[in-house]
């Protein structure tokens, strides 16, 4: 009986010779559980597993803890891959995180973290980041040290408020912090002075809601 080939991430898929960007099936580490992800095989050498994407506001990102844990949306459009999969993937191997951003004026920028991982659910999928480079700000817009993940039904931030309810979307809120890529999507000309938009402060400043965002990961030794 021929054993089915499984891939844990898009880098493995790329190295297997499948080098076209698109949706692929990934398998949880040490498991048969599967998840569908978008693989970017063109950006910067390819092999990127997309874990978040925003582009048009077609998907509601004000979701529950369970939904952020398991993932939602469509890998062909707006989606969240799932905290549990990303946690398991990044805890067993060293990954880099690239965050690609677009504004409404036609500019693009990125932040690259040389080491990224999420703690497990018992630690509220706390984010860990080191080694920031890139064009989207010299200071990390994800608060350092990393915060726990919060959603509308699971408040783990450091604010007297409930950041996820106030700003909308699940995120690694501080109190509430300089970023929220899962905030409310606002169209062009309605995207400034927003208290709950898609925010990356150290690139576009306060209240500016971005046009498009992509978070993607790849093994550091790719």
């Amino acid at each position: 009986k021929e054993e089915k080939t499984t891939f844990r991430d898009c880098a493995e898929i790329f190295k297997s010779g499948l080098t076209t960007s698109g949706i692929y099936t990934l398998t949880f580490p040490n498991s048969t559980e599967e998840v569908k992800a978008y693989c970017d095989m063109d950006m910067g050498g390819g092999g990127w597993t997309v874990i978040q994407h925003r582009e048009d506001g077609s998907v509601d990102f004000q979701r529950t803890w369970k939904e952020y844990k398991e993932g939602f949306g469509s890998p062909l459009g707006e989606y969240w891959l799932g905290n549990e999969f990303v946690s398991q993937l990044t805890s067993g191997h060293r990954y880099v995180l690239k965050i690609q951003l677009k504004d409404w004026e036609g500019s693009e920028a990125h932040s690259l973290y040389e080491h990224f991982y999420l703690s497990g659910e018992e630690s509220n999928y706390r984010i860990h980041l080191t080694g920031l480079t890139g064009t989207a700000g010299k200071i990390s817009s994800i608060s350092q040290p990393g915060s726990d993940f919060s959603t509308k039904d699971s408040d783990n931030d450091k604010c007297i408020c409930k950041c996820s309810q106030m700003l909308t979307g699940g995120w690694w809120f501080d109190a509430c912090g300089p970023s929220n890529l899962n905030g409310q999507y606002y169209p062009q000309k309605q995207n400034t002075n927003k208290f709950n938009g898609i925010k990356w402060y150290y690139w576009k400043g306060s209240g500016y809601s971005l046009k498009a965002t992509t978070m993607m990961i790849r093994p550091a030794d790719f």
Epitope: C159, I160, C161, C163, M166, A175, K194, F195, S206, G207
Partner: nanobody, 129 residues
Framework: EVQLVESGGGLVQPGGSLRLSCAAS????????IGWFRQAPGKEREGVSA????????YYADSVKGRFTISSDNSKNTVYLQMNSLRPEDTAVYYC??????????????????????WGQGTLVTVSS
């Protein structure tokens, strides 16, 4: 639509006074803190003063304590900055900005710059003889 409009800037002699106004629309002051910031040419934007809880809590930078007074008129949805004993080093563009009042870190009294998501266009204050 959230809007903040500053007014009251101008040219004043050292030792003189000015009163800046910040008119807010699209939200009510009851649930928000309003900060005044300033930016001199070639310098970083810095916090000057802030107010929340209908004036129950106020903040002043050390450089303006005793000279500047912040106040609010919630019926007009406007915040004021009374600036007395002005000095040449007070010359800057003055901005007002808003943040939901609840967006406070446990144990803290005021807000970092990046929490202020709504900003006005600014008003220029020049202190010169």
């Amino acid at each position: 639509e959230v809007q903040l409009v500053e007014s009251g800037g101008g040219l004043v002699q050292p030792g003189g006074s000015l009163r800046l106004s910040c008119a807010a629309s699209g939200f009510t002051l009851d649930d928000y803190a309003i900060g005044w910031f300033r930016q001199a040419p070639g310098k970083e934007r810095e916090g000057v003063s802030a107010i929340r809880d209908n004036g129950g809590s106020t903040y002043y930078a050390d450089s303006v304590k005793g000279r500047f007074t912040i106040s609010s008129d919630n019926s007009k949805n406007t915040v004021y900055l009374q600036m007395n004993s002005l000095r040449p080093e007070d010359t800057a563009v003055y901005y007002c900005a808003a943040v939901p009042a609840g967006r406070l870190r446990f144990g803290e009294q005021w807000y970092p710059l990046y929490e202020y998501d709504a900003w006005g266009q600014g008003t220029l204050v020049t202190v010169s003889s």
